[in-house]
């Protein structure tokens, strides 16, 4: 989690701070959404359970050329213990369901807020 505070982070970021920063970024994306996010790109829906940070990254990493979610992709990689590359899929994907990136972000944001409220940071 060291790098989650941004590139100029002075040291390890507490998990609660890292999660808050991810929430802040997703709120920022939601608030600033004028045109369809990532041109309405579709991604695999995921089960919001244990391991969902990697699953979320695996879904979003397949969206290319969308600067709005680049920071989110970087932040999610800090929560995922293994390296994720495009085309990778975990069992957490709901493989028959694709949703717009905007809906994906909303669903993820709600879940992360609940985790933050419950004190589940990792």
């Amino acid at each position: 989690l060291t790098c989650l505070g941004g590139f100029a982070s002075p040291g390890p970021v507490p998990p609660s701070t890292a999660l808050r920063e991810l929430i802040e970024e997703l709120v920022n994306i939601t608030q600033n959404q004028k045109a369809p996010l990532c041109n309405g790109s579709m991604v695999w829906s995921i089960n919001l359970t244990a391991g969902m940070y990697c699953a979320a990254l695996e879904s979003l990493i397949n969206v290319s050329g969308c600067s709005a979610i680049e920071k989110t992709q970087r932040m999610l990689s800090g929560f995922c213990p293994h390296k994720v590359s495009a085309g990778q899929f975990s069992s957490l994907h709901v493989r028959d369901t694709k949703i717009e990136v905007a809906q994906f972000v909303k669903d993820l944001l709600l879940h992360l807020k609940k985790l933050f409220r419950e004190g589940q940071f990792n």
């Epitope: 609660s16 808050r20 709120v27 939601t30 608030q31 709600l110 933050f116 409220r117 004190g119």
Partner: antibody, heavy 125, light 112 residues
Framework: QVQLVQSGAEVKKPGSSVKVSCKAS????????MHWVRQAPGQGLEWMGT????????KYVPKFQGRVTITADESTSTAYMELSSLRSEDTAVYYC??????????????????WGQGTLVTVSS | DIVMTQSPLSLPVTPGEPASISCRSS???????????LEWYLQKPGQSPRLLIY???DRFSGVPDRFSGSGSGTDFTLKISRVEADDVGIYYC?????????FGQGTKLEIK
């Protein structure tokens, strides 16, 4: 507009069970926590437990553990509280309440911002 | 369980005068995420409770600015700058930081 409408008053025998419903409208229950709070006649408020309707996760007060079951049905936007092995001390008004989350605030835990009208459960032989 | 103790239990106030209710928790109620989930509710006679203040000092929408919350750690206060006749009822503090979440025993505000 936001509403929580609870089922009607119940009279129950000691040892039996009661199931109170709370029908939500004006919002998606998956975006909330749904809570249950009770109030015995002339007494204060007592939090009983909560459910996250998005995944069914529950938290209960230990004194009710094993006797209370909180559930939620996303398809009907309804939360339920079932209390078993009823005794006279369970005579109370039972309230449901929600805590909502939205997309536009970083930390928007709005506490129990809307409440149902209450359901009187009377336990008497 | 965390015990929330309110004082006074009864509070007679003259309209236009200020009022203050204290709430003390038996242990620190700072949540692991850094927030303090201390709330205040008002229950008017024959009605369901309604939210006034959350996270110590955040006023819920529609709540008059005559109501304010303050405090930290284990000591919290609800202040009404100028009491109105409509403010009568029972005021409850509540902690939502540590399960099981708990209410104070209530403070009955009445008009002198």
């Amino acid at each position: 507009q936001v509403q929580l409408v609870q089922s009607g008053a119940e009279v129950k025998k000691p040892g039996s069970s009661v199931k109170v419903s709370c029908k939500a409208s004006g919002f998606y229950i998956k975006d909330t926590y749904m809570h249950w709070v009770r109030q015995a006649p002339g007494q204060g408020l007592e939090w009983m437990g909560t459910i996250d309707p998005a995944n069914g996760n529950t938290k209960y007060v230990p004194k009710f553990q094993g006797r209370v079951t909180i559930t939620a049905d996303e398809s009907t936007s309804t939360a339920y509280m079932e209390l078993s092995s009823l005794r006279s001390e369970d005579t109370a008004v039972y309230y449901c309440a929600r805590s909502i989350y939205d997309d536009y605030h970083v930390d928007d835990y709005y506490a129990m911002d809307y409440w149902g009208q209450g359901t009187l459960v009377t336990v008497s032989s | 369980d965390i015990v929330m103790t309110q004082s006074p239990l009864s509070l007679p106030v003259t309209p236009g005068e200020p009022a203050s209710i204290s709430c003390r928790s038996s242990q620190n109620i700072v949540h692991i995420n850094g927030n303090t989930y201390l709330e205040w509710y008002l229950q008017k006679p024959g009605q369901s409770p309604r939210l006034l203040i959350y996270k110590i000092s955040d006023r819920f929408s529609g709540v008059p600015d005559r109501f304010s919350g303050s405090g930290s750690g284990t000591d919290f206060t609800l202040k009404i700058s100028r009491v109105e006749a409509d403010d009568v009822g029972i005021y409850y503090c509540f902690q939502g930081s540590h399960v099981p979440w708990t209410f104070g025993q209530g403070t009955k505000l009445e008009i002198k």
